[in-house]
C-alpha cells in the first residue's frame, strides 16, 4: 500500500471546522 | 506544523475491499470534522463521507454512491480517521485525500479498482 | 443536490494583474444561523487542494490578503488582485451548507 503525506501551510494548528453547516440537511430536490 | 499522512491505497479488484487510514498530527484531532474526498479525472472532486467530532456524537454522512458500502471511523487517542470500502467499483477508482472538515488536508493515496 | 458552477473554465493572467473567477449555485447557500458556507479552494500543479477562503470572504490563516471573496445566496465570486507566479494551478468553490457537500468543476490559473 502507498502512504503518502501533505503538509499545510495554514499557521492555525486547530482545525476550522467553520466551512461547513453545523448541523447540515440534505439538499432540498428541484 | 500539522500534517495529516494518508495510507493503505492500491490496486483492488471490483468487489473487493480495502480499508484507508489517515493519521493527524499537529492539530487539535478531537475537536476536528474529519472528511474523506476523492479526485478523478471523470468526476474532478467529489465528497465522500464525514465524520464529527464528540461534541456532536461522532455523526457520519455520506455521499449516496457510498452509502451502505463505504464506513467512516475515528480514533481519537490515535489522531486517525479510517474509510473502510468494501464491494468496490471502477467508479470508486481515484486519489482519496482525508481533509479535516475541508481546512487541512493530506496529500492524498490513490485506489484503483480493476480487474 | 447543489451544482456548483464555475465560470471561465481557465485564464490566462500576467503576473501582476487581477484575476477573477465566479461561482453560481444552483441553491441558496444561505444556512439558517444566517451564515453562508461557500469556500475557495487552490490546488497547485502536483500537490492536494489547500483551504484559501471559508464562509464566502473570511481568508485562512497564512493566505495572501491579495485573495478575497465575495457574493451571496447563489453567486459567488474569488478575486487575486495581483497574480504571482505561486498562483497558478486549479482555484474550485465548494458548498458547505447542504449535503452532500458540492464542488465546482475547477478554473485553470494560467500564468502569461
Known amino acids: 500500500s502507498e502512504t503518502t503525506t501533505g503538509t499545510s501551510s495554514n499557521s492555525s494548528q486547530s482545525t476550522s471546522n467553520s466551512g461547513l453547516a453545523p448541523n447540515p440537511t440534505n439538499a432540498t430536490t428541484k | 506544523e500539522v500534517k495529516f499522512e494518508e495510507s493503505g491505497g492500491g490496486l483492488v479488484q471490483p468487489g473487493g475491499s480495502i480499508k484507508l487510514s489517515c493519521a493527524a498530527s499537529?492539530?487539535?484531532?478531537?475537536?476536528?470534522?474529519m472528511d474523506w474526498v476523492r479526485q478523478s479525472p471523470e468526476k474532478g472532486l467529489e465528497w465522500v463521507a464525514e465524520?464529527?467530532?464528540?461534541?456532536?456524537?461522532?455523526?457520519?454522512y455520506y455521499a449516496e454512491s457510498v452509502k451502505g458500502r463505504f464506513t467512516i471511523s475515528r480514533d481519537d487517542s490515535k489522531g486517525r480517521v479510517y474509510l473502510q470500502m468494501n464491494n468496490l467499483r471502477t467508479e470508486d477508482t481515484g486519489i482519496y485525500y482525508c481533509?479535516?472538515?475541508?481546512?487541512?488536508w493530506g496529500q492524498g493515496t490513490s485506489v484503483t479498482v480493476s480487474s | 443536490d447543489i451544482v456548483m458552477t464555475q465560470t471561465p473554465l481557465s485564464l490566462s493572467v500576467t503576473i501582476g494583474q487581477p484575476a477573477s473567477i465566479s461561482c453560481k449555485s444552483s441553491?441558496?447557500?444561505?444556512?439558517?444561523?444566517?451564515?453562508?458556507?461557500l469556500n475557495w479552494l487552490q490546488q497547485r500543479p502536483g500537490q492536494s487542494p489547500k483551504r484559501l477562503i471559508y464562509?464566502?470572504?473570511k481568508l485562512d490563516p497564512g493566505i495572501p490578503d491579495r485573495f478575497s471573496g465575495s457574493g451571496s445566496e447563489t453567486d459567488f465570486t474569488l478575486k487575486i488582485s495581483r497574480v504571482e507566479a505561486e498562483d497558478l494551478g486549479i482555484y474550485y468553490c465548494?458548498?458547505?451548507?447542504?449535503?452532500?457537500?458540492?464542488f465546482g468543476g475547477g478554473t485553470k490559473l494560467e500564468i502569461k
Open positions: 481533509t479535516g472538515a475541508m481546512d487541512y
Open positions: 499537529g492539530v487539535t484531532f478531537s475537536e476536528a470534522w
Open positions: 465524520i464529527r467530532d464528540k461534541t456532536k456524537n461522532y455523526v457520519t
Open positions: 441553491q441558496s447557500l444561505l444556512y439558517s444561523n444566517g451564515k453562508t458556507y
Open positions: 464562509q464566502v470572504s
Open positions: 465548494m458548498q458547505g451548507s447542504s449535503l452532500p457537500w458540492t
